[in-house]
């Protein structure tokens, strides 16, 4: 059993998130993460999950009766959705804390608005390498 | 020229995005889209970089001078990330939506933990077609 | 400060096996990712092991096939690496390296710092 | 493979600049982050340049690193060059199965 399940029940039992009434009025990511099948499809929502999680036990962090869960969670997060590779998960901490009130970050993130909309789309990205047009090909049918 | 290439200029013209200190201190978005190339990665980081757009438009819906600008892109994200697949969209802004300081979204959460984590590595998805079978292969010694 | 003291080490005839220790003070070892490298006489740097720290991933060089195994007792603050069906080749000075907080909570930089080895050398 | 590629050896005099470079093989450069360490004779290996472009506290900022993404290289400069310099350099990073690769290290002579 990998080691997360133990810590997501030490989890439950700190949230009282085992009790029965908690189910009511459907589930708030399962039954997206059902809908969607194509790993880039999954990706996008997956992301925003993750960063929900991160915000959740950043807001906990400081609290000793489950520190070492939420650390174990982190790094099985980190495994899982990052594979591991601490650039990836350090970008994506970037992006997750600018924040969106500051003048500064709106102004260059207007600047930017061109050539991320620009590369948005997955046909968007020119002179890529043959492995990226051999996947674009693969899932042109799906 | 994509319509929202004439709407972003007039956003750069309201937040003055377009003076030459914006660039100052390396960017926001794009030198972290230039780490990622692999369409599964790509889409990670664009989640988040689309819901801080979206969170930023969302501050000033209100404001006559850039509705139309704000609603053409919000539109073109539509058509280019979300494929103009309105569930796609919807499911998006259902997870963005969700309050971390909430504590029945917080129960919900941790109550959903073990499943959201077992599905977060391609390798966890069970029934996919051979392509996933192959990732599992190469990642069979971890 | 932080320390990583490496041993067990020696010789060993081919088709022996050995188990080497790396002894860590100085930070909190139960948070950090874990590596072994090694290097031949005369020869560059090796990879060979690493291992999470709190969710017990293990990562192997494709070279050794499966003749190795990395554990931790995060209680004694210890890194070990079960060598068997050693050969000549696995001659090396093996190193024990600290890598990064894998949670993310005080990430740390990965290889930052090294014990001073311990050599095993694989003789008939 | 994954290999990163670095030149055998480079030599030059005291007060010059070099450059090693370490191209990857497969994967992008870009995606993973790029380590260097110096290792002189007997020693043992000590990081001179961290997550691509940074310096940990103590190496002298004659000490730089970068990443060229048209090449699909890391490179580490050294100005300035010293005699203290004359040392192995390896690069290191990772794969997509989160192995650690090492470059075949560089030998940095100081000329005399």
């Known amino acids: 059993q990998d080691p997360y399940v133990k810590e997501a029940e030490n989890l439950k039992k700190y949230f009282n998130a085992g009790d029965p009434d908690v189910a009511d009025n459907g589930t708030l990511f399962l039954d997206i993460l059902r809908n969607w099948k194509e790993e880039s499809d999954r990706k996008i929502m997956q992301s925003q999950i993750v960063s929900f999680y991160f915000k959740l036990f950043k807001n906990f962090k400081d609290d000793q009766r489950i520190q070492k869960s939420v650390e174990t969670i982190k790094e099985d997060i980190n495994v899982k959705f990052f594979n591991s590779n601490k650039k990836k998960r350090d970008d994506f901490e970037k992006l997750t804390n600018y924040s969106v009130t500051d003048s500064n970050v709106q102004r260059k993130a207007v600047h930017e608005l061109i050539q991320v909309m620009a590369e948005l789309s997955p046909a968007a990205k020119i002179g890529k390498r043959k492995r990226s047009q051999m996947f674009r090909g693969r899932r042109a049918s799906q | 020229q994509d319509p929202y290439v004439k709407e972003a200029e007039n956003l750069k013209k309201y937040f003055n995005a377009g003076d030459p200190d914006v660039a100052d201190n390396g960017t926001l978005f794009l030198d972290i889209l230039r780490n990622w190339k692999e369409e599964s990665d790509r889409k990670i980081m664009q989640s988040q970089i689309v819901s801080f757009y979206f969170k930023l438009f969302k501050n000033f819906k209100d404001d006559q001078r850039i509705q139309k600008s704000v609603e053409t892109i919000k539109e073109d994200i539509n058509v280019k990330f979300f494929n103009s697949n309105k569930k796609k969209r919807d499911d998006f802004e259902k997870l963005t939506n969700y309050s971390v300081t909430d504590s029945n979204v917080q129960r919900k959460a941790v109550h959903e933990l073990i499943q959201v984590m077992a599905e977060l590595s391609p390798a966890a998805k069970i029934g996919k077609r051979k392509r996933s079978q192959m990732f599992r292969g190469r990642r069979a010694s971890q | 400060e932080v320390q990583l003291v490496e041993s067990g080490g020696g010789l060993v005839k081919p088709g022996g096996s050995l188990r080497l220790s790396c002894a860590a003070s100085?930070?909190?070892?139960?948070?950090?990712?874990m590596h072994w490298v090694r290097q031949a006489p005369g020869k560059g740097l090796e990879w060979v092991s690493s291992?999470?720290?709190?969710?017990?991933?293990?990562y192997y060089a494709d070279s050794l096939k499966g003749r190795f195994l990395i554990s931790r007792d995060n209680d004694r603050d210890s890194l070990y690496l079960e060598m068997n069906s050693l050969g000549v080749e696995d001659t090396a000075i093996y190193f024990c390296?600290?890598?990064?907080?894998?949670?993310?909570?005080?990430?740390?930089?990965?290889?930052?710092?090294w014990g001073q080895g311990t050599l095993v050398t694989v003789s008939s | 493979n994954f290999m990163l590629t670095q030149p055998h050896s480079v030599s030059e005099s005291p007060g010059k600049t070099i450059t090693i470079s370490c191209t990857r093989g497969r994967g992008y450069i870009a995606s993973y982050y790029v380590q260097w360490y110096q290792q002189r004779p007997g020693g043992v290996p000590k990081i001179v340049v961290f997550?691509?472009?940074?310096?940990p506290s103590g190496v002298p900022d004659r000490i730089s690193g970068s990443i060229d993404t048209s090449t699909n290289s890391a490179s580490l400069t050294i100005s300035g060059l010293q005699t203290e310099d004359e040392a192995d350099y390896y690069c290191?990073?990772?794969?997509?199965?989160?192995?650690?690769?090492f470059g075949g290290g560089t030998k940095l002579t100081v000329l005399g």
């Open positions: 997550e691509d472009t940074q310096r």
């Open positions: 390296a600290r890598g990064y907080d894998t949670s993310g909570s005080d990430s740390g930089v990965d290889f930052q710092y």
């Open positions: 100085g930070f909190p070892f139960s948070r950090y990712s």
């Open positions: 291992m999470t720290s709190r969710t017990n991933h293990k």
């Open positions: 290191q990073s990772y794969d997509d199965a989160n192995h650690v690769i």
